[in-house]
């Protein structure tokens, strides 16, 4: 009998989308509506995830796979499998406990999520600020002040030739 293909476990023949029904001699039964089994041989079906409230359905639940959620406009996913939705802020802002707040001077955020990050300190790399930073954009670092001295060439020298045997794969 197909049901008993495996002498060790008669449930092993139950395909994804079904469960091994303990109520009737371990016969494979289809998962009820709004439940699923993503692998064969399962003894129960898992309840489908419901995308409610701030969550919306990205992929419907089927008998073999769970529903997948994303977030309604104005929110973005956090966590594995979009386990949470977090409010979007504007660029130049970050989300705090009191809501969206502008980035402090010297910090920026170029996305609708995440925190404000400090502007790059150009001088740490021996460079100067070419374009000032804003709440939405980082500073743009330019050549070091020494490179801008009179007579200094602003032409970028050619890249050195690669050594033999080290060409890109």
């Amino acid at each position: 009998f197909e049901r008993t293909r495996s002498l060790q476990d008669p449930c092993s023949n139950c395909p994804a989308g079904t469960f091994c029904d303990n109520n009737r001699n371990q016969i494979c039964s289809p998962c009820p509506p709004n439940s699923f089994s993503s692998a064969g041989g399962q003894r129960t079906c898992d309840i489908c995830r419901q995308c409610k409230g701030v969550f919306r359905t990205r992929k419907e639940c089927s008998s073999t796979s769970n529903a997948e959620c994303d977030c309604t406009p104005g929110f973005h996913c956090l966590g594995a499998g979009c386990s949470m939705c977090e409010q979007d802020c504007k660029q130049g802002q970050e989300l705090t406990k009191k809501g969206c707040k502008d980035c402090c001077f010297g910090t920026f955020n170029d996305q609708k999520r995440g925190i404000c990050r400090p502007w790059t300190n150009c001088s740490l790399d021996g460079k100067s600020v070419l374009v000032n930073g804003t709440k939405e954009r980082d500073v743009v670092c330019g050549p070091s002040p020494a490179d801008l001295s009179p007579g200094a060439s602003s032409v970028t020298p050619p890249a050195p030739a690669r050594e033999p045997g080290h060409s890109p794969q």
Partner: antibody, heavy 123, light 108 residues
């Protein structure tokens, strides 16, 4: 609501293979088992076997060596093949939706049947 | 396999009378998986009762089912002209699914 319609040749020669198709309309073939049942003239009902939408099958041991079932989810159809037929295979053949559970795990029996198709085995 | 035995083979009754049909299983069957079907000449079987006692959609209240274990009963409280047909019990508790041989309810 779900409806089933059997189709296939009404006459099959002895030793040949009987082939029938059941088309599911008004709903998806997915997520259910689907059964074939037959009824010889003037006799009772005999369960032939069932198939899940993934192609997993269970057959009646009395017919297992001659039965093959398949499913085509893209066409919402499932099929029966019965090989090496004899006059004893002359019957009305029905397809039906196999038993299933609702969300509260109440079990429903074979609740939807096709109207049946008569197959005669004769030379 | 589970053998389902129905009795009597034929029941001759008049309209308005009560019909009691018996179904016995060769081994215990969970009542959740016991169904009754009605079949009229030239028609497909129609599910009447599932879970031994629950009427299917659209089935009149004069049909009732009862029983557990190995003994099950279908009762038609007051036969109507359209009720004269063949009735089958069926189990899908264990493979292979099996039907009783049927009880014919005929007009006396």
């Amino acid at each position: 609501q779900v409806q089933l319609q059997e189709s296939g040749p009404g006459l099959v020669k002895p030793s040949e293979t009987l082939s029938l198709t059941c088309t599911v309309s008004g709903g998806s073939i997915s997520s259910y088992y689907w059964s074939w049942i037959r009824q010889p003239p003037g006799k009772g009902l005999e369960w032939i076997g069932r198939i899940y939408t993934s192609g997993s099958t269970n057959y009646n041991p009395s017919l297992k060596s001659r039965v093959t079932m398949s499913v085509d989810t893209s066409k919402n159809q499932f099929s029966l093949k019965l090989s090496s037929v004899t006059a004893a295979d002359t019957a009305v053949y029905y397809c039906a939706r196999d038993g299933w559970y609702d969300e509260d795990y109440n079990y429903y029996g074979m609740d939807v049947w096709g109207q049946g198709t008569t197959v005669t085995v004769s030379s | 396999e589970i053998v389902m035995t129905q009795s009597p083979a034929t029941l001759s009754l008049s309209p308005g009378e009560r019909a009691t049909l018996s179904c016995r299983a060769s081994q215990s069957v969970s009542s959740n998986y016991l169904s009754w079907f009605q079949q009229k000449p030239g028609q497909a079987p129609r599910l009447l009762i599932y879970g031994a006692s629950t009427r299917a959609t659209g089935i009149p209240a004069r049909f009732s089912g009862s029983g557990s274990g190995t003994d099950f009963t279908l009762t038609i409280s007051s036969l109507q002209p359209e009720d004269f047909a063949v009735y089958y019990c069926q189990q899908d508790y264990d493979l292979p699914w099996t039907f009783g041989q049927g009880t014919k309810v005929e007009i006396k």
